[in-house]
């Protein structure tokens, strides 16, 4: 507890102090007082620097004195032999004695009293900015007129803060402008405008005179502008050193004027006004701004329209334009939206064709569809090249967004048939020579594939079995080979309406209109062993002449076998119909005159015994296309004959092209269209 005075005596005083003693006293007087410490008696063993025994006086970290030896007063009217005056309210006294004393020493007697200190004069640092007033135990600061004492109770300043300017235009000046501004002041001015307006400050150079910076470039007095997280300044000196027009990009501005104790100048004057907040004319790639202006400000609205081939994607929805508003913060709304290249996406796959994985699916990218050559070709033209258009679709110059259609190439065998007359009436053949050849197992017969979904055959083949099992792609027809070949499943059988159905088909003498179509449930995949034969054209080019050669193929009866195991084929010439009429019917079921011959029939054969026979029915009589020698078309279908190994009769397919096309169109699937 602080005291105003006190006494300090060495141990055993006034008797001799003991050896090896260390004792300390902590003196404390009230705040605002100093300490006067004085010794009235001092008898301590003398040594150099008082190394043996001593009394030490310490103030804070500073040793005020160290005493030893004997002292006596110089003043007969005063008992004081040594004294210390400190302007602080705390002091420590430490007494030390060593292990031996040569004589008997009595120590010391000391007293302390609290003394008033003059804070206004006793310290290097003046405690008050203006007027300092001392009193016993303390001091207080005071200020000249129009100044006020700050909260620190030491500094005086003028009352220049707290002004808030909300008008869109105004003028602000330093206190007393153009007279010298007050020293030691901090003036804060606030400009607060409506959101969407930025504060623009304008100054004239001559309206600014503030104490210049020190040698290190630090302003002693300074003017600072603070707008949000942006600061302009500090500024000082003669003539405004900053930009004469300050666009703060903020609706709130704090002006801070700080002065020190010295060097007052005339100060400063500024004008401010509120500008609608500008939004930057951003460079948004691949787009056009409407309206186009040199400058956009708060509340301006623009429509940003993407160039062709670009779109703005928001979530999953793509649009070609969007609106953006200049906001109060000087930023555009929807600023995250960008015009990106249209993405056409992964191109759709097509049946029997492919499209290479594109390097890019963005606007302007190019892809190429190809058909699985040589078995398919592009039916609807266009070349297969598509580019990613501005509307996000893959577009072809000819077809537009319609996809190409790969349809089977018809009438082109992978290997040409080389006829050899080693077997009377025909040769071994490979299915690759006749990839259109279809095998019917009940009855044992043939047919011709004419496209992915349709098989052409003779009416008499399917009249007794409307759900025939058919196979394609195999040269041999053993059970094991058929199991490895492609089985075709019929969906419906269409027999020509002109074919007369009989109760006893075995007695048939009229084979007119011996033609039928089988619609398949699933499309046939084409390849080297399976591909269709063409149909004849309707022009006169497809009218057969006597001697024209055609190929027949099948697994029908041969000289050695009732049924062939491996495909057989022969090349036959077209013959006049009378040649067929002249041949005697083998095992006739009726009078020879009863057999009907019509223009719907082709007669062919007669050379070297080459002919179709039982089991070949429905197979194609394939003739080279007169307009494209690489292709074969089905000129006829194996129908009937008077006698194997002579002449045979074939259904004249040309006469039925209209019926074939109509039947296929009326019974096509949406997938095929």
């Amino acid at each position: 507890e602080p005291t105003m005075y006190g006494e300090i005596l060495s141990p055993n005083y006034p008797q001799a102090y003991p050896s090896e003693v260390e004792k300390s006293w902590d003196i404390e007087v009230p705040e605002g007082y100093g300490i006067h410490l004085y010794f009235t008696h001092l008898d301590i063993e003398l040594s150099e620097n008082c190394a043996y025994d001593s009394v030490q006086i310490i103030s804070g970290d500073t040793e005020e004195g160290r005493l030893c030896g004997q002292r006596s007063s110089n003043n007969p009217h005063s008992p004081i032999v040594e004294e210390f005056q400190v302007p602080y309210n705390k002091l420590q006294v430490i007494f030390k004695s060593d292990f031996s004393n040569e004589e008997r020493f009595t120590g010391f007697a000391a007293y302390y009293v609290a003394t008033d200190i003059n804070e206004c004069t006793d310290f290097v640092d003046v405690p008050c900015s203006h007027f300092c007033n001392n009193f016993i135990g303390g001091y207080f600061c005071s200020c000249p007129p129009e100044y006020f004492l700050h909260d620190d109770m030491k500094n005086c300043g003028v009352n220049c803060s707290g002004d808030v300017f909300t008008a869109l235009i105004g003028e602000i000046a330093s206190p007393n402008y153009p007279k010298p501004y007050p020293e030691n002041s901090r003036c804060e001015y606030q400009i607060r405008l409506e959101k969407g307006f930025q504060v623009v400050v304008t100054l004239r150079r001559e309206d600014f005179d503030v104490e210049a910076a020190d040698s290190a470039g630090n302003c002693l007095d300074s003017l600072v502008f603070v707008a949000g997280d942006r600061q302009f300044g500090p500024y000082c000196g003669h003539g405004f050193p900053g930009p004469l027009n300050i666009e703060t990009k903020s609706n709130a501005l704090d002006i801070i004027f700080q002065t020190d104790l010295t060097g007052q100048k005339k100060g400063w004057k500024l004008r401010y006004h509120g500008d609608p907040m500008p939004c930057p004319k951003e460079d948004t790639p691949n787009s056009v701004w409407e309206p186009a202006k040199a400058k956009y400000v708060f509340r301006d609205v623009v429509q940003i329209t993407c160039l062709d081939g670009f779109e703005v994607v928001e979530g999953r929805v793509g649009a070609t334009s969007f609106y953006s508003t200049c906001q109060s913060n000087g930023k555009w709304s929807n600023s995250k939206l960008k015009c990106q290249p249209v993405d056409c996406g992964i191109p759709e796959s097509i049946e029997n064709g492919k499209v290479e994985d594109p390097e890019s699916t963005l606007f302007g990218s190019v892809i190429r569809y190809t058909c699985e050559e040589p078995y398919y070709y592009m039916e609807n033209g266009g070349g297969g090249e598509y580019h990613c258009a501005g509307n996000g679709s893959w577009v072809n110059e000819v077809l537009g967004p319609e996809l190409p259609k790969c349809v089977p190439v018809c009438g082109v065998p992978r290997e040409p048939f080389e006829e050899k007359q080693r077997i009377i009436g025909g040769s071994d053949a490979d299915i690759k020579n006749f990839p259109w050849q279809v095998f019917f197992d009940n009855p044992w017969a043939g047919g011709a594939l004419i496209n992915e979904y349709w098989v052409l055959t003779a009416a008499h083949v399917v009249e007794g079995n409307r759900e025939p099992t058919m196979y394609v792609g195999s040269t041999s027809v053993q059970t094991s080979r058929l199991a490895k070949s492609k089985m075709l499943t019929p969906e419906h059988v269409f027999i020509h309406p002109g074919w007369k159905l009989l109760e006893v088909p075995e007695g048939r003498t009229n084979f007119d209109n011996d033609i039928a179509l089988v619609r398949l449930k699933d499309p046939v995949k084409m390849g080297p062993t399976v591909s269709p034969i063409c149909l004849p054209g309707t022009s006169s080019d497809y009218n057969l002449m006597d001697g024209d050669l055609g190929l027949i193929s099948g697994w029908g009866r041969t000289e050695k076998r009732d049924r062939a195991v491996r495909l057989k084929a022969a090349r036959l010439p077209v013959a006049p119909l009378r040649k067929c009429k002249e041949v005697k019917v083998e095992k006739p079921t009726a009078d020879a005159e009863a057999y009907v011959f019509t223009p719907n029939m082709i007669c062919a054969g007669g050379e070297k015994g080459m002919d179709s026979c039982k089991g070949d029915s429905g197979g194609a009589f394939a003739v080279q296309d007169p307009n494209d020698k690489t292709k074969f078309y089905a000129a006829g279908l194996v129908s009937w004959g008077p006698q194997c190994g002579t002449y045979g009769l074939y259904t004249r397919v040309k006469n039925y092209v209209d019926w074939i096309m109509k039947t296929m169109q009326e019974n096509s699937t949406p997938r095929e269209d």
């Epitope: 077997i423 053993q478 094991s480 041969t558 195991v565």
Partner: antibody
Amino acid sequence: EVQLVESGGGLVKPGGSLRLSCAASGFTFSDYYMSWIRQAPGKGLEWVSYISRSGSTKYYAHSVKGRFTISRDNAKNSLYLQMNSLRAEDTAVYYCARDETDYAYDEWGQGTLVTVSS
Amino acid sequence: DIQMTQSPSSLSASVGDRVTITCQASQDISNYLNWYQQKPGKAPKLLIYDASNLETGVPSRFSGSGSGTDFTFTISSLQPEDIATYYCHQYEDYPLTFGGGTKVEIK
């Protein structure tokens, strides 16, 4: 007169290769499917390989698949059997045979002996 | 693979005797079967095709029958020149396979 004459047989070490040839005459070679058939000493017949008229279709016995290759040259009226990675069990008389029609072998060569031994 | 089991593996008969050889397939082969004759040191010769059809130029004492899995080859009257090994051969599926052979000798 129809003739099929095999050649190219002989002694070869295991792992070695041989190429057998069959020269055809007296008929139109390109008309016929052809086959190789072998017969190990004192054993029965074993079908080895078959080739179509044009040479586009070929079949092999499991025991030789991947090691033997059948081929033909219609211009030279010749049938070939390239035998690689030969094994002791490939030792046999190798016949080339004409497939008259539908897998019936109506003409055979006299055979050529292949011996695989170290 | 289709296995062809031929029996007997050998037989001895007198001239004029009726000789029967059987061949059994491990699965149905329809009538896709041929019979061959091989005389010692010679190449085989086609006798019967499609199980029952006699090849041109082959004596009529040779005949074949059967369908599916069981087949029979018959020499109605054995002749001295018939001494040979006889093989059945299926062509229903690849790989084509032969029977083990039946060696026919004269007593």
